[in-house]
Every structure is written in C-alpha cells, then in structure tokens.
Amino acid sequence: HTAAQDNCTCPTNKMTVCSPDGPGGRCQCRALGSGMAVDCSTLTSKCLLLKARMSAPKNARTLVRPSEHALVDNDGLYDPDCDPEGRFKARQCNQTSVCWCVNSVGVRRTDKGDLSLRCDELVRTHHILIDLRHRPTAGAFNHSDLDAELRRLFRERYRLHPKFVAAVHYEQPTIQIELRQNTSQKAAGDVDIGDAAYYFERDIKGESLFQGRGGLDLRVRGEPLQVERTLIYYLDEIPPKFSMKRLT
C-alpha cells in the first residue's frame, strides 16, 4: 500500500498531493513543500512534515528527571533541509546565512554560527521523554490501564512497535512516556521514535496529520484522557555542544 487506491489519498499524511500517476496507474502521493514521494502506509518523516507545514497557507491557530543533556525544542518552526530519504540534514541554515546543527528530530544541538559551521554527522535522538499533564478527573487513572492504552495507541495509530515504548510513568496528573530506539535496534521498516512522537504531539494539540480521520480520542477504560500541557525532551546518542554562555 502506498496510498488509498479507491479515492487516491494518503491516510497517514494530509499534507500531500496525490494522483494516479504511479506505476500501473497506482495512486502516488507527494509531500507539499518538497514534492518528495511518500509511503502512505507508514508515518511521513518529521522533516518532510515540517517542510510541508512551512509551505502551507498560514492559519491562525515515579517520574523521570530529564538528564542535563536533554534538549527541548525552543526554536519552534523553521523550514528545514531534508535529505533524499526525507531525514533532516545535519546542518540547517536560514535565509540570513545563520547555521546550526540538528539531531535526527530536527532540534538544534549546537550554538548558531555562520556558513562555515560544520556538522559532521546527523546525531541520532535515541531517547524521547514525552511529559504530559492531564486535566483533573474524578480519580487517578489506573497505571497499568494507562500503560496498556498508550502502548496500544502507539502501535495501532503510529505503527510503533511496543518494544520502543520503554516505559509509561504516572504520578497524577503527570504522565511520562519514554520512547527509546538505538540505531542497532531500528530495523528497516520500523517507525522512527521521532516521527511517532511528532505525530502524537500534533494529535494531542488537535492538529492531526492523518487524512480524513477524527482527531485523537484518548480514553482509558472509557474515561477521557484530556491533555492540558505537553513537554517533549530529546536525548541524543552524543550529548549536544552548546557554549557555557547558553547554560547560564
């Protein structure tokens, strides 16, 4: 499956243009912004999604302590450069020739520099901590029910094997989902934890990337789980390189 054959749409990415011009008249979909062909049977890479988002018309719109090397995406949106596989290029630059290095989820991991800045390799983000605060409920959720439902969600909606959901922590009202995926663990065809986390983040914010599907309706044993705050921490296989100035 590359796309829904019947009406030629991309179930996993609504930010695409699809037409039956693939081999044998098959439906083929291309991401907005980059024009790259996407596989609609799986999640589209975050880089292509960010690029598409920047090209689209603008609308008004027992807990883990993150390590000292954890990154938070403070820079927000930018128009990224993606490689031919749809991954982030290690070096990103803006229109004013300001450049910086990013990790595999596109988050800046160095100070900003000029065009002479070198980023030798794309450093993999192997550990993502999704920190959620849910709205008040009658009582706390059952931890094992919550764990099971979130694992099911990541498997069925985001196609992430549960072996990459390292843990689900819960101390009402805080939920933490730990995603882990080393380079050696990730087989061909496995969804990247960075892409799954991005789809989840957009779902939680009510900005679903899925084509023609209802928004995310998260329930634990029938009880709605409504998220009022999300924070995502990214840990790379190699710690980031920031000057001391940034850390003070």
Epitope: H1, A148, R152, R155, E156, R157, R159, K163, R180
Partner: antibody, heavy 119, light 111 residues
Framework: QVQLVQSGAEVKKPGASVKVSCKAS????????INWVRQAPGQGLEWMGV????????SYNQKFKGRVTMTTDTSTSTAYMELRSLRSDDTAVYYC????????????WGQGTMVTVSS | EIVLTQSPATLSLSPGERATLSCRVS??????????MHWYQQKPGQAPRLLIY???NLESGIPARFSGSGSGTDFTLTISSLEPEDFAVYYC?????????FGGGTKVEIK
C-alpha cells in the same frame, strides 16, 4: 464481551484457494490488529501474519509471502485470510487472534477453521 | 528468526503437584526491561488461551496458581499446584521480532 467468530470448515483440492473469515464483536474493531496463526494436525502453532484494522495493510511471515492475503471489512468488523496454491501440508486449523493492549500478546482467539487439502 | 525451545516435551505429574515449564530463546526478547514473551494453554479441540504476557503478567481471569518468570533468553511458567483442568499443552511465544514464533509446546499429562 470480546468475541472472534470464524467461518466453517473447508475441504479444498491442491492448487485451489481458501478464504477464511473472522468476525469481531464486543470492541471497536479498528482499535486492534488481527493476527492469523495456523496449526497442522498434532503440530505446534505457526504465525502467518498480522493485519492493521486501522490502516488495512498487512505484514506477512516470509514463509507465506506471495501465497497469503489478509484483508478487512470495517463495515462488518470482519478480517479475512486467503491462502492460494494450496498444498496438502496446508491442512491445518487456522485461527484469527487479536492483539492485546500493550505487548503484542494475542489476548482473544477465534474458535479455529479446519482447512483440509486433499485430492 | 527467533527460535524458542521448550522443555521438557512432556511432563507427567499428579494433581496437586508443582509444574515447571521452561522456554529458551535463541536471542534476547528484552527491550528496556520489557520482555516480549507470552505463555498460552491449549486443550484438545480448543483455541489457545493467553495465560501470561510480558513474561510475568497474569492475564485477567487466569487463576493465581499460574506464574511466569525470567528475562532475556530464559523463561519459566510455573503452575504451583496442578488442578485437573490444567492438564493441557503449553506454548511460549515471542512478539519481539517479526516473524513472531512459538515454542514446540510442553504437554502436561496426568501421571
């Protein structure tokens, strides 16, 4: 309560195809993928593949690739498994089984469909 | 593919006795402390029934005399005191890696 009800026994000739159905009830069909497992007489269990009821696409055991097709009909909450080019060693009980919540365990099983391949 | 080896092939015991079934895996099915190993019971003419998931978690509705242990490549299913209805075939299964595979089974029979 969750139930998976399969179609009845089949007798097929070598080279023919068989299509087994698995009707789900008692839960939201598109929330859980469906696996297919077979068991030859007196033998162990063999996983054939899994179909996403949410997306409609399947992942097959390499052993059956090219001969098996798994599909779903969300309007009737039914999963199907078609096996082509049948041989005598395909004689087995075929089970559908639902993924459990968190760890890809199979928490509910159909009652099984006996498929006999004989000339 | 991951190969699961169960032993013994047959276990002859009397009701009330303790049963210990072993499952050895060709490579680790542990991911960050989560073991993708499950146990099923099958009686003649019936579909398998999930007993234990994630190596040691008791499935809802399964009696507490069943327990699972182990991690990585060595796993055990224990039935603390055999009841007449426990005489059946038991299978271990890994869901760490596609293709998912089952052990050859251990038959627990009445002595």
């Amino acid at each position: 309560q969750v139930q998976l009800v399969q179609s009845g026994a089949e007798v097929k000739k070598p080279g023919a195809s068989v299509k087994v159905s698995c009707k789900a009830s008692g839960y939201t069909f598109t929330d859980y993928s469906i696996n297919w497992v077979r068991q030859a007489p007196g033998q162990g269990l063999e996983w054939m593949g899994v179909i996403s009821t949410y997306y409609g696409d399947a992942s097959y055991n390499q052993k059956f690739k090219g001969r098996v097709t798994m599909t779903t009909d969300t309007s009737t909450s039914t999963a199907y498994m078609e096996l082509r080019s049948l041989r005598s060693d395909d004689t087995a009980v075929y089970y559908c089984a639902r993924y459990g919540d968190g760890y890809n365990q199979f928490d509910y099983w159909g009652q099984g469909t006996m498929v006999t391949v004989s000339s | 593919e991951i190969v699961l080896t169960q032993s013994p092939a047959t276990l002859s015991l009397s009701p009330g006795e303790r049963a210990t079934l072993s499952c050895r895996v060709s490579e680790s099915v542990d991911s960050y402390g989560n073991n993708f190993m499950h146990w099923y019971q099958q009686k003649p003419g019936q579909a398998p029934r999930l007993l234990i998931y994630r190596a040691s978690n008791l499935e809802s509705g399964i009696p507490a005399r069943f327990s699972g242990s182990g991690s990585g490549t060595d796993f055990t299913l224990t039935i603390s005191s055999l009841e007449p209805e426990d005489f059946a075939v038991y299978y271990c299964q890994q869901s760490y890696e596609d293709p998912y595979t089952f052990g050859g089974g251990t038959k627990v029979e009445i002595k």
